[in-house]
Interface confidence: medium
C-alpha cells in the first residue's frame, strides 16, 4: 500500500532504535571514509526529520523518497570531492541514477586500518559510559569495511555484542570472558559478510532470477514438507528482501525481513515443524534463527524424481509451455530430496537438466534422448564429493595452519600474478573451511564446504575485478557463479607466468616479528611462502616444506635469543642463502 510519507512509515514500523541503526549502516556503507561523528550527526538529523513526518505526514519534504532524502544528506557533506574524488560526481545526477552511482562506488576493499579491538578494561569503560555510542561505533566500523553487510543481520550482531559486554563487563576477569565470545561473534559476522556479498553479486551480475533459483534450492532443502507454492512464495519474498539490502534500501529490507519472519511464524504448519523455537524469540534473534534453522525431516513417501521429470510423456510439453515454472519444480523436487548437496551443485544439476531438455525436445524421439539424464548427473555429483574427501583428509592430516599453507601454494601456482596479500587472505579464508566443515557429520560436509568456498572465491573475483592481472582468474570469474568453484579447482600451474626475481629483502625479517600476535606471525610466514612460490612456481612440496621448516626454526631460535637483533641480522642472510640453495 502507498504511504504519504515513506520515511514516517519506516520509522513507525521499525522503531527509533532500529531506524537509527539502519540509517547509520546505510551512510557508513555509502561513504566509507567519513568518521563516526560525521555520520552520527547526519543520522540524528534524519531521525529528527522522520519524527516531524510522523507528527505530520504532509509536512514539507515528507513525501520525498528515501533515496532522495538520504542522497541529499550525503551530497551536502562538505569536502565531498576532496575526500571521495569522483564519487562526488554522483551528486550531479537525479534519482534513481544517483543511488545507482553511489552503489557503483562502494569499495569492497577500502584502505582502512584493520578494526582493532580495544583491551577489555577500556572497552568496558566506554561501553558503560555510553552504550548507544559504543554500539554506534561498532555498526559504523563494520559497515564501512563491509559495504554489503546484510543490515538487519548487522543489527543482530550488534545486539550479540551488547549482550556479551553487559555480561562480561560485570565479571572480575573481563578479558577471558570477552575474548572467546567476541572472537566467536567476529568469526560468524565475517562469514555472514562473505555470504551476503555472494548474494549481492548474484543479484548484480545475473539478476533476480538467478537469486530466486538459489533461494528455491536452499528453502526446499530446509523445508522439504512445504509444497512448491509455499517455497515459491518464500523465495519471492526472500529475493525482494535481498534485492532491497543489496540495493542500499536498508529500511525497506529490514521491514520486509521482519514481515517475512512474521509470515513464517504464522504459517509454520505449511512450512516446517522446526520453527517454533525460533518463533519464540524477539525480532532480530527470530529472523537470524529462521535463516539458519535446521532442516525439517524429509517426507518418507516421496516418489522417485524420474516419474515426473524423465518417465512422464509430457516432459517436453511441460517444459515448452512454462520453462521457468517447470525447471523451478525440478529444482524444488531435487533439492528437497538432497539436503546433503550444496546449493551450487543443485543449481548445476538443474542447469544440466535444462540443457538436456533444450537439446532433446528438439529431436525426433525426445524420451529416448533425455531418458539417461539422471545418470548423467553422476560425474557432476562425484566431483564435489571427491573435493570434500581430499581436502578434509588433508585438513585432518595438517591442521588449519598447515592446510592454509597447502592451499596457499596451490592457489599461488594457479594465479601467481595475483597480489600476495590477496592470495594470503584468500588462502587463510579457504583454509578455514576445514575447521568449519570437516568436523561436521558426513551428510553436512558437502553443502558446508562448497557453499563456503563459493562465497570466498566470490571475494577473490571482486578483488581481482578491481585490478585484473591473471587470465586464469578472469576466466573463472567471468563464468556463472555456480561454475566458479569447479573452475578454480580445475586450474593447474600457470605455464605463462615468468617467475619473479629472487629478492633477499622479501625474505629478510627483524626482531619485531617476535612480539606479534600468533595470527600476524602466521601471515608474515605465509607471505614469505607465497613469495617463494612466485619465485619457484614448480618447486616441489618437499622443497617448500624444507624451506618453511628452516624458516620456522630460524624464527624460533632468534626470538628466544638474548640479543634478538644480532641473531636476526646474522642468521637472516644465512637463511636466505639456504633458501636459494634448497630451491635451486
Amino acid at each position: 500500500e502507498a504511504h504519504k510519507s515513506e520515511i514516517a512509515h519506516r520509522y513507525n514500523d521499525l522503531g527509533e532504535q532500529h531506524f537509527k541503526g539502519l540509517v547509520l549502516i546505510a551512510f557508513s556503507q555509502y561513504l566509507q571514509k567519513c568518521s563516526y561523528d560525521e555520520h552520527a550527526k547526519l543520522v540524528q538529523e534524519v531521525t529528527d526529520f522522520a519524527k516531524t513526518c510522523v507528527a505530520d505526514e504532509s509536512a514539507a519534504n515528507c513525501d520525498k523518497s528515501l533515496h532522495t532524502l538520504f542522497g541529499d544528506k550525503l551530497c551536502a557533506i562538505p569536502n565531498l570531492r576532496e575526500n571521495y574524488g569522483e564519487l562526488a560526481d554522483c551528486c550531479t545526477k537525479q534519482e534513481p541514477e544517483r543511488n545507482e552511482c553511489f552503489l557503483q562506488h562502494k569499495d569492497d576493499n577500502p584502505s582502512l586500518p584493520p578494526f582493532e579491538r580495544p583491551e577489555a578494561e577500556a572497552m568496558c569503560t566506554s561501553f558503560k559510559e555510553n552504550p548507544t555510542t559504543f554500539m554506534g561505533h561498532y555498526l559504523h566500523e563494520v559497515a564501512r569495511r563491509h559495504p554489503y553487510f546484510y543490515a538487519p543481520e548487522l543489527l543482530y550482531y550488534a545486539e550479540q555484542y551488547n549482550e556479551i559486554l553487559t555480561q562480561c563487563c560485570a565479571e572480575a576477569d573481563k578479558e577471558s570472558c570477552l575474548t572467546p565470545k567476541l572472537d566467536g561473534v567476529k568469526e560468524k559476522a565475517l562469514v555472514s559478510s562473505v555470504r551476503q556479498r555472494m548474494k549481492c553479486s548474484s543479484m548484480q551480475k545475473f539478476g533476480e532470477r538467478a537469486f530466486k533459483a538459489w533461494a528455491v534450492a536452499r528453502l526446499s532443502q530446509t523445508f522439504p514438507n512445504a509444497d512448491f507454492a509455499e517455497i515459491t512464495k518464500l523465495a519471492t519474498d526472500l529475493t525482494k528482501v535481498n534485492k532491497e539490502c543489496c540495493h542500499g534500501d536498508l529500511l525497506e529490507c529490514a521491514d520486509d525481513r521482519a514481515e517475512l519472519a512474521k509470515y513464517m511464524c504464522e504459517n509454520q504448519a505449511t512450512i516446517s515443524s522446526k520453527l517454533q523455537t525460533c518463533c519464540d524469540k524477539p525480532l532480530l534473534k527470530k529472523a537470524h534463527c529462521l535463516s539458519e534453522v535446521e532442516h525439517d525431516t524429509m517426507p518418507a513417501d516421496l516418489p522417485a524424481i524420474a516419474a515426473d521429470f524423465v518417465e512422464d510423456q509430457e516432459v517436453c510439453k511441460n517444459y515448452a509451455e512454462a520453462k521457468d515454472v517447470f525447471l523451478g519444480t525440478f529444482l524444488y523436487e531435487y533439492s528437497r530430496r538432497h539436503p546433503d548437496y550444496s546449493v551450487s551443485l543443485l543449481l548445476r544439476l538443474a542447469k544440466k537438466y535444462e540443457a538436456t531438455l533444450e537439446k532433446c525436445c528438439a529431436e525426433a524421439n525426445p524420451p529416448a534422448c533425455y531418458g539417461t539424464v539422471l545418470a548423467e548427473f553422476q560425474p557432476l555429483v562425484e566431483e564435489p564429493k571427491n573435493l570434500v574427501k581430499t581436502n578434509c583428509d588433508l585438513y585432518e592430516k595438517l591442521g588449519e595452519y598447515g592446510f592454509q599453507n597447502a592451499i596457499l601454494v596451490r592457489y599461488t601456482q594457479k594465479a601467481p600474478q595475483v597480489s600476495t596479500p590477496t592470495l594470503v587472505e584468500a588462502a587463510r579464508n579457504l583454509g578455514r573451511v576445514g575447521t568449519k566443515c570437516c568436523t561436521l557429520p558426513e551428510d553436512q560436509r558437502l553443502p558446508c564446504v562448497e557453499d563456503y568456498l563459493s562465497a570466498i572465491l566470490n571475494r577473490v573475483c571482486l578483488l581481482h575485478e578491481k585490478t585484473p592481472v591473471s587470465e586464469h582468474v578472469t576466466k573463472c570469474c567471468s563464468g556463472s557463479l555456480v561454475e566458479r568453484r569447479p573452475c578454480f579447482s580445475a586450474l593447474t600451474v600457470d605455464e605463462t607466468y615468468v617467475p619473479k626475481e629472487f629478492k633477499a629483502e622479501t625474505f629478510t625479517f627483524h626482531s619485531d616479528i617476535c612480539t606479534l600476535p600468533e595470527k600476524e606471525k602466521q601471515i608474515k610466514k605465509q607471505t614469505a611462502l607465497a613469495e617463494l612460490v612466485k619465485h619457484k612456481p614448480k618447486a616441489t612440496a618437499e622443497q617448500l616444506k624444507t624451506v618453511m621448516d628452516d624458516f620456522a626454526q630460524f624464527l624460533d631460535t632468534c626470538c628466544k635469543a638474548a640479543d634478538k637483533d644480532t641473531c636476526f641480522s646474522t642468521e637472516g642472510p644465512n637463511l636466505v642463502t639456504r633458501c636459494k640453495d634448497a630451491l635451486a
Epitope: D227, F228, A307, D308, D312, N318, E321, A322, V325, T329
Partner: nanobody, 126 residues
Framework: EVQLLESGGGLVQPGGSLRLSCAAS????????VAWFRQAPGKGREFVAG????????YYADSVKGRFTISRDNSKNTLYLQMNSLRPEDTAVYYC???????????????????WGQGTLVTVSS
C-alpha cells in the same frame, strides 16, 4: 490436506453433453495440479484430462481430445470438465485428483496424486 467433492454426473444419451464439477477445500486450486480420471467397470483408473497449477496448461487423453474441456474457476475454487459428444465408452465413475505444490506437472500416473474425490457416475446410454 485437500478435500475434493465431485458433482454433475448422471445419465445422458450418446452425442449429449454433461459438465462435471469438483469443489476443492483446504488448498487453493490454482496452486495445485489437478486432473480428472475415470474408472469403467472392471478396468483400472484412466487419465482423462489435467490442468497445471499456477499456469493453465491443459492435457488430454487421446480418446477425449476435441470433445472434453478441462477448466477451473479460481474464485470458486472449483475444477470443471465439460464433456461433449459423449459416447457409450465414456461410461465410468469420474474422479477428481490433486497434486498440491506441483504446478504444471499433472502426471497421467494415478499413483502420483495423493488426494482424490469420492467419484461421480456418468452413464452414456440410449
Amino acid at each position: 490436506e485437500v478435500q475434493l467433492l465431485e458433482s454433475g454426473g448422471g445419465l445422458v444419451q450418446p452425442g449429449g453433453s454433461l459438465r462435471l464439477s469438483c469443489a476443492a477445500s483446504g488448498r487453493y486450486i490454482d496452486e495445485t495440479a489437478v486432473a480428472w480420471f475415470r474408472q469403467a467397470p472392471g478396468k483400472g483408473r484412466e487419465f482423462v484430462a489435467g490442468i497445471g497449477g499456477g499456469v493453465d496448461i491443459t492435457y488430454y487423453a487421446d480418446s477425449v481430445k476435441g470433445r472434453f474441456t478441462i477448466s477451473r474457476d479460481n474464485s470458486k475454487n472449483t475444477l470443471y470438465l465439460q464433456m461433449n459428444s459423449l459416447r457409450p465408452e465414456d461410461t465410468a465413475v469420474y474422479y477428481c485428483a490433486a497434486r498440491p505444490g506441483r504446478p504444471l506437472i499433472t502426471s497421467k500416473v494415478a499413483d502420483l496424486y495423493p488426494y482424490w474425490g469420492q467419484g461421480t457416475l456418468v452413464t452414456v446410454s440410449s
